[in-house]
């Protein structure tokens, strides 16, 4: 594809040199390269007062590319831009800008957040659980036989975690206690089948957050598994203030 | 608001010229290249022509080479496209477009019929 | 020249289906591609540029993916106001090329 060409080039540059250095095809001592070797690309550098042209594999940082049948040329982007589709279209902002749609902006538009790690403003993403499970079999220090009340848990999955500006992921566990029908342990029985059991049911919908205490269980004595149960909600506590995901709750 | 508005359009007979223009406004002219697209009815999108942002260098499709001329007015911010020795296939809407690697505005088209 | 070979060049999607619409490039574009939709009687209008990248404006529902020489606009639900004509154009080099075109109709 032949282009039609103005001469005001050549007569710009009336010491053009064909001695050129570095990937140039033509050049002059005062502004360097004036057309380059091909699939090269031609940028025009401003050094001081003076614009040097300079041929390159690719565009660098700031520009973005045009291949025209005769000539490869880098133009530059936005100030703010650091890589462009075009002068209209950025695709990656200098450091301290948030690109949305093409353009880099000190601050995400209302109902968007800033990704600090992509440098983009994306859309506020809340948490999402799955419906609960069935809740488990009625146990005691891991046995379902050999005692009347006991606990029994349910779980349900982060089906999507939340962005910074979200909303916080409700607990992913629940744990109530349980009567049943006490039932002799088989020799070297751990029981691992549910039993019938009457159950005292949270309310509606919600289940409140307690301690374990030891009322109404065989032992006085701290088992294992509500010291897992007190430390876990520790541990959602400190992650409460740090905005994390909240994972386990106790219900009784 | 960004506005290209095509003008000169009409019937012509094989052979005869035309000339087409656009006049732009709502954004830096002088900073665009500029080109033609046409569209033949009920058909795809053409490329025709683009002109560089300083007028300095022009390119055609092979089917128009030598017949037509895009020129530009920076100074006025319009854009010409002067077509001879027009042949039936040049028959479309033609559209007058900023070209900076995708076409960002498009002007509303101004229709070219080459009839007999 | 870059060849772009569109298709399907026709179909029509039930309001709230998915629809993909495909544009293969006869040589490497890298990420240089851009989408437009033409509504009837109306000039194109630029949808999709650097093959994924959303004009502003348009609705999330429209997205673009591919890469190298294949490339493809996905419509998430489709609407009354989705039904037009979209062209894929190759941004890689001169001369730019467009698709033949793909006609989204409604059912």
């Known amino acids: 594809q032949n282009a039609s060409r103005g001469r005001r080039q050549r007569r710009m540059h009336p010491n053009v040199s064909q001695g050129c250095q570095g990937g140039c095809a033509t050049c002059s001592d005062y502004n360097g390269c004036l057309s380059c070797k091909p699939r090269l690309f031609f940028v025009l550098e401003r050094i001081g007062m003076k614009q040097i042209g300079v041929c390159l594999s690719s565009c660098p940082s700031g520009y973005y590319g045009t291949r025209y049948p005769d000539i490869n040329k880098c133009t530059k982007c936005k100030a703010d831009c650091d890589t462009c589709f075009n002068k209209n279209f950025c695709t990656k902002c200098k450091s301290g800008f948030y690109l949305h749609l093409g353009k880099c902006l000190d601050n995400c538009p209302e109902g968007l957040e800033a990704n600090n790690h992509t440098m983009e403003c994306v859309n506020i993403v809340h948490c999402e659980v799955s419906e609960w499970n069935p809740w488990s079999p009625c146990t005691k220090k891991g046995k379902t036989c050999g005692f009347k009340r006991g606990t029994e848990t349910r779980v349900r999955e982060i089906m999507q975690h939340p962005s910074a500006k979200g909303n916080l992921c409700p607990p992913t566990n629940e744990t109530r206690k349980c009567t049943v029908q006490r039932k002799k342990c088989q020799k070297g029985e751990r029981g691992k089948k549910g039993r019938e059991r009457k159950r005292k049911k949270p309310n509606k919908g919600e289940s409140k957050e307690a301690i374990p205490d030891s009322k109404g269980l065989e032992s006085s004595k701290e088992t294992p598994e509500q010291r897992e149960n007190k430390q876990q909600q520790k541990k959602r506590k400190v992650q409460d203030k740090q905005q994390k995901s909240v994972s386990v709750s106790t219900v009784h | 608001e960004v506005q290209l508005v095509e003008s000169g359009g009409g019937s012509v007979q094989p052979g005869r010229s035309l000339k087409v223009s656009c006049a732009a406004s709502?954004?830096?002219?002088?900073?665009?290249?500029m080109a033609w697209v046409r569209q033949a009815p009920k058909k795809g999108l053409e490329w025709v022509a683009t002109?560089?942002?300083?007028?300095?260098?022009?390119y055609y499709r092979d089917s128009v080479k030598g017949r037509f001329t895009l020129s530009r007015d920076n100074t006025k911010s319009t854009l010409c496209l002067q077509m001879d020795s027009l042949r039936s296939e040049d028959t479309a809407t033609y559209y007058c477009?900023?070209?900076?690697?995708?076409?960002?505005?498009w002007g509303q088209g101004i229709m070219v019929t080459v009839s007999s | 020249d870059i060849q772009m070979t569109q298709s399907p060049a026709s179909l029509s999607a039930s309001l709230g289906e998915t629809v993909s619409i495909e544009c293969l490039a006869s040589?490497?574009?890298?990420?240089?591609l851009v989408w437009y939709q033409q509504k009837s009687g109306k000039s194109p209008q630029l949808l999709i540029y650097?093959?994924?990248r959303l004009q502003d404006g348009v609705p999330s529902r429209f997205s673009g993916s591919g890469f190298g020489t294949r490339f493809s606009l996905k419509i998430s639900g489709m609407q009354p106001e989705d039904e037009a004509d979209y062209f894929c154009?190759?941004?890689?080099?001169?001369?730019?090329?467009f698709g033949a075109g793909t006609k989204l109709g409604l059912k």
């Open positions: 040589e490497d574009i890298s990420n240089d």
């Open positions: 709502g954004f830096t002219f002088s900073d665009y290249d």
């Open positions: 650097a093959a994924s």
């Open positions: 477009a900023a070209h900076d690697r995708s076409f960002d505005y």
């Open positions: 154009q190759q941004s890689y080099k001169y001369l730019p090329t």
């Open positions: 002109i560089i942002y300083d007028g300095s260098r022009t």
